[in-house]
């Protein structure tokens, strides 16, 4: 069980997770081509944007994070991949504290992108209310930025 005292450790951990090259991959029958990955990213983008905007409106007192954008593309593969396994535990962790319906839809999409046989780390959210809100905001900001990055990479090929 990983515990965090605030968003800085979370951001550092997630950044490291994103940069870790993936050694395993899905079973062939479940591996998706770039076209399908793009479809899933297109589904995720409005969900992620909406969740972030709603949270920012609801939690106006929480400072916006200006952390470095996540390097969420696997640098050794073409096309680039979203490291779903590194992101999923965070959405599972914040699910009880945010919009469950939207979070469930995001988790459903991320599950489709998940590499099989990859263990998911269990994440605990900070106990402090303010730190918890900042933790959630950071996740949502980093994830939105990550999706934009993946989508741009998928679109920059010979389309």
């Amino acid at each position: 069980m990983l515990s965090h005292t605030g968003p800085s450790r979370f951001a550092l951990f997630l950044l490291c997770s994103m940069e870790t090259l993936l050694s395993s991959h899905m079973a062939p029958t479940h591996q998706l081509p770039p076209s399908d990955v793009r479809k899933i990213i297109l589904e995720l983008q409005p969900l992620s944007r909406g969740l972030l905007e709603d949270y920012q409106k609801k939690e106006t007192g929480v400072p916006e994070s200006n952390r470095t954008l996540l390097l969420c593309l696997t640098s050794d593969s073409q096309p680039p991949r979203l490291n779903s396994s590194a992101i999923l535990p965070y959405f599972r962790a914040i699910r009880p504290l945010s919009d469950k319906n939207i979070i469930d839809k995001i988790i459903e999409q991320l599950d489709k992108l998940k590499f099989q046989h990859e263990p998911e780390t269990e994440i605990s959210v900070p106990a402090d209310t303010f730190e918890c809100k900042s933790f959630i905001l950071t996740i949502l900001q980093q994830f939105s930025a990550c999706l934009e990055s993946v989508f741009k990479s998928l679109n920059s090929g010979p389309q």
């Epitope: 081509p33 770039p34 899933i40």
Partner: antibody, heavy 118, light 111 residues
Amino acid sequence: EVQLVESGPSLVKPGGSLRLTCSVTGDSITSGYWNWIRKFPGNKLEYMGYISYSGITDYNPSLKSRITISRDTSKNQYYLQLNSVTTEDTATYYCARYGNYGYAMDYWGQGTSVTVSS
Amino acid sequence: DIVMTQSPASLSVSLGQRATISCRASESVDTYGNSFMHWYQQKPGQSPKLLIYRASNLESGIPARFGGSGSGTDFTLTIDPVQADDVATYYCQQSYEDPWTFGGGTKLEIK
């Protein structure tokens, strides 16, 4: 059994808009991806775009400025609108389902022939 | 866009013989051992019908005389033995990358 049926005008004037309907039975358009494809007189097939189960759309870049795909979930129908048509848009238009990731378009409509002419 | 080149454009085969249709993609359509290449049959006046998905998987209800093979950029559809009912145009299609693209078609006739 999944069935798709295309309908719409068979003749459209150059510069006008083409609007086609795909009526789906045997499946809900709130699952899967729902596509438009056309076949030109020379038999060339062109993929045009889709609307997803959630209403997200994506189009072939070659048509992006002219194409809109929309839907009416209460009628289980989806639509193709193509603006500023020319004689080059004369084709047979098909709707088709893409049901599962990593699969293929498994159900197609019978097609509707559209001629662009003044 | 990935360009799909089919050959031959037309093919005349005797009943009971083997028909072989080739499709070449301008770049690989493979991901982790799966080839996102599909084959369709279109009979005159009908809509395309899925025969083979992911290069070699026979769609449900399609006779076993239809077969698909290949990987990377080169793919083959085989019909053996050819029957009178197989007169149609056959298309390959890639779903690896957007936009999806089709081959130009191969018209199969009976000799």
